[in-house]
């Protein structure tokens, strides 16, 4: 079993300030650990790169909403 206390924690120390088209984003995860200096969102892009973003920014919130809807919509 992994040791939660010693498990590595991914943190964001800087945020991108560039708007990114949601069409380049594949998924996201929220960073809320108290071990990190700030709350963050990490987007994974369509080419599997990871980007730290500020959850307070509107484009980040809109992108998360879009990705949530995309996940909920079953493929036909």
């Amino acid at each position: 079993q992994p040791d939660a206390i010693n498990a590595p924690v991914t943190c964001c120390y800087n945020f991108t300030n560039r708007k990114i088209s949601v069409q380049r984003l594949a998924s996201y995860r929220r960073i809320t650990s108290s071990k990190c200096p700030k709350e963050a969102v990490i987007f994974k892009t369509i080419v599997a790169k990871e980007i730290c973003a500020d959850p307070k920014q509107k484009w980040v919130q809109d992108s998360m909403d879009h990705l949530d809807k995309q996940t909920q919509t079953p493929k036909t």
Epitope: N17, S21, V47, K49
Partner: antibody, heavy 120, light 113 residues
């Protein structure tokens, strides 16, 4: 509406360097990903490089690596492209370009172009 | 790098007739999870910068006449001008934006017959 205004035409000798500027208005430079594309006379479009938020840095086409530098002055919302060790094949129109709706990889806004002539 | 190949290099079409330009990528630019094709078409007239016509392979840019349409998926794409007008004389380029470096087709020159 984003507008991109470039500096004027340049004539350079082989081996020299040239710097082309691109002034952004209608949005702040820090929210945009600026790129440079060139076009030799009578030829097609060639992407040179630009800021890639997926890497968090400026990336360059392999062909130009080591010879091109792209920089930003956020205080004046101006981007610069410097190309060194110029040769006659670098004679081209140089465009700055961006996607004003958020970085995607295509360009909906272009500067008017800057003709750089390399001739001895 | 992804290689983009357009055909034909040039074509002459009578006014009011259909013009068809093809673009082939050396690997797929379709991201299956969102069903998006990362391909765009530009129009360039002499002495002007390129103008965005179509993105995501088939989405017309605001203000572009509906005689322009884009189709295709994966590696094979088409730009169609349904009824050629005099002002459509230009060079047309495709570009992929799935993987950097972004790459362009060599261009197709459209003229009036």
């Amino acid at each position: 509406q984003v507008q991109l205004v470039q500096s004027g035409a340049e004539v350079k000798k082989p081996g020299a360097s040239v710097q082309v500027s691109c002034k952004v208005s209608g949005d702040t430079l820090t929210e945009l990903s600026m790129h440079w594309v060139r076009q030799a006379p009578g030829k097609g479009l060639e992407w040179m490089g630009g800021f890639d938020p997926e890497d968090g840095e400026t990336i360059y086409a392999r062909k130009f690596q080591g010879r091109v530098t792209m920089t930003e002055d956020t205080s004046t919302d101006t981007v610069y492209m410097e190309l060194s060790s110029l040769r006659s094949e670098d004679t081209a129109v140089y465009f700055c370009a961006t996607d004003s709706r958020g970085y995607s990889g295509y360009f909906d806004n272009w500067g008017q172009g800057t003709l750089v002539t390399v001739s001895s | 790098d992804i290689v983009m190949t357009q055909s034909p290099d040039s074509l002459a079409v009578s006014l009011g007739e259909r013009a068809t330009i093809n673009c082939k990528s050396s690997q797929s630019v379709l991201y299956s999870s969102n069903n998006n094709n990362y391909l765009v078409w530009y129009q360039q007239k002499p002495g002007q910068p390129p103008k965005l016509l179509i993105y995501w392979a088939s989405t017309r840019e605001f203000g572009v006449p509906d005689r322009f349409s884009g189709s295709g998926s994966g590696t094979d794409f088409t730009l169609t001008i349904s009824s050629l007008q005099a002002e459509d004389v230009a060079v047309y380029y495709c570009q992929q934006y799935y993987f950097s470096p972004w790459t362009f087709g060599q261009g197709t020159k459209v003229e009036i017959k």
